[in-house]
Interface confidence: medium
């Protein structure tokens, strides 16, 4: 079950819930946003204060890391399996250091299997964080510091830090280095969403959340 099912079962308070995959006993703890846009959102990534190191290995990004109440990555394997069960939407919520907020909403999102390097698939962009997708289209394979699957002759994950669906290296990286206020400009390896804040601007906060399309 995901946060949408938790919501439908009567739990309408934001918080950390234990989720499971269909036909599986494997459990994962995730933060559920039960208020935003009707609730039922499973948070798959959050950045807010730089308390968690996001320069992690392939295995760590596979299984997840961090604290679901704070900064964390839910895990590529869980998200891949979940988003291949039914159609999901992806909402990415962004905050800058000037008090502005924006979002990108993709009407269809799923990750390929690990054998296909958790390649991201996205369709139907709307929202206020740019008319062009800051996640390169068509989607790229996931790369980490120990798994170079990008389209650059360089190693994007090593240079820019963090695991991401790097192109060469692409217009976004929400798992980059966390830079505090007044140190957040001219930072190519920061938390980037190019088509909202341009080059070199490192964001204050990000949340990636998913929900079934038919919720």
């Amino acid at each position: 079950r995901d946060c949408a099912e938790v919501f439908k079962s009567g739990h309408t308070t934001n918080g950390v819930y234990t989720l499971t995959l269909p036909n599986s006993t494997e459990e994962v703890k995730a933060y559920c946003d039960m208020e935003a846009g009707g609730g039922g959102w499973t948070i798959i990534q959050r950045r807010e204060d730089g308390s968690v190191d996001f320069q992690r290995t392939w295995k760590e990004y596979k299984v997840g890391f961090g604290n679901p109440s704070g900064e964390y990555w839910l895990g590529n394997e869980f998200v891949s399996q979940l988003t291949n069960q039914q159609r999901y939407v992806l909402k990415i919520h962004l905050k800058d250091w000037e008090g502005n907020e924006a979002y990108s909403l993709y009407e269809h999102f799923y990750l390929s299997s690990e054998e296909l390097n958790y390649r991201i698939h996205l369709k139907g962009l709307t929202g206020t964080a740019g008319k062009i997708s800051s996640i390169s289209q068509p989607g790229n394979d996931f790369s980490t510091k120990d798994a170079d699957n990008d389209k650059c002759i360089c190693k994007c994950s090593q240079m820019l830090t963090g695991g991401w669906w790097f192109d060469a290296c692409g217009p976004s990286n929400l798992n980059g280095m966390y830079y505090p206020q007044r140190q957040n400009t001219n930072k190519f390896n920061g938390i980037k969403w190019y088509y909202w804040k341009g080059s070199g601007y490192s964001l204050k906060g990000t949340t990636m959340m998913i929900r079934p399309a038919d919720f």
Epitope: N186, F188, S199
Partner: antibody, heavy 122, light 107 residues
């Protein structure tokens, strides 16, 4: 094979203008940041300007700011540098340069053109 | 602006020698440094990026090290084709700046 072919250089009087072009082939031009780097005769390398993949972000060395303009036409796979109010100290070979990545704030040049000579003299 | 200072400005060496060139940044640039080789009348060629990452196709006798303000380019066994001028360049912040160059000459 990546190729960058500059053109447009030549002799120009102080205060004059030139437009340099760089025709790119062998790679997906629209996916990479592009730069201009120059080298005065017998001197070292000097970074001039860089432009982002979309053309929306441009940056310049202080020595050329307000006089030079970098632009790109992704449909034509071409990079440009408009040189105005030219001075004798702008005399140099101008290289068109492809970045290793698309990150406009990190210029590692992995491919260079052959260069085009700009001579500013009366 | 970040100033990049290379030393020595020239070095005389023989084929087979180990050659070390240093580059110092006027402020911390983490590991955002590149090394280029340039031969007379030719465009520069990228050897090393991100301080120590060897560019594809570059012989393994070239290596880079360092972080912060002090960086080194080493040619482990000098070959005849390595006689050239070498430049370091910081990619940490705008404006991007190059070192003055080090000319490796035949002894």
């Amino acid at each position: 094979e990546v190729q960058l072919l500059e053109s447009g250089g030549g002799l120009v009087q102080p205060g004059g203008s030139l437009r340099l072009s760089c025709a790119a082939s062998g790679f997906t031009f629209r996916k990479y940041a592009m730069s201009w780097v120059r080298q005065a005769p017998g001197k070292g390398l000097e970074w001039v300007s860089v432009i982002s993949v979309s053309g929306g972000n441009t940056y310049y060395a202080d020595s050329v700011k307000g006089r030079f303009t970098i632009s790109r036409d992704n449909s034509k796979n071409t990079l440009y540098l408009q040189l105005n109010s030219l001075r004798a100290e702008d005399t140099a070979v101008y290289y068109c340069a492809k970045d290793l990545t698309d990150i406009v704030l990190m210029v590692y040049v992995d491919y260079w053109g052959q260069g085009t000579l700009v001579t500013v003299s009366s | 602006d970040i100033q990049m200072t290379q030393s020595p400005s020239s070095v005389s060496a023989s084929v087979g020698d180990r050659v070390t060139i240093t580059c110092r940044a006027s402020q911390d640039i983490d590991r955002w440094l590149a090394w280029y080789q340039q031969k007379p009348g030719k465009a520069p060629k990228l050897l090393i990026y991100a301080a120590s990452s060897l560019q594809s196709g570059v012989p393994s006798r070239f290596s880079g090290s360092g972080s912060g303000t002090d960086f080194t380019l080493t040619i482990s066994t000098l070959q005849p084709e390595d006689f050239a001028t070498y430049y370091c360049q910081q990619a940490n912040s705008l404006p991007f700046t190059f070192g003055g160059g080090t000319k490796v000459e035949i002894k």
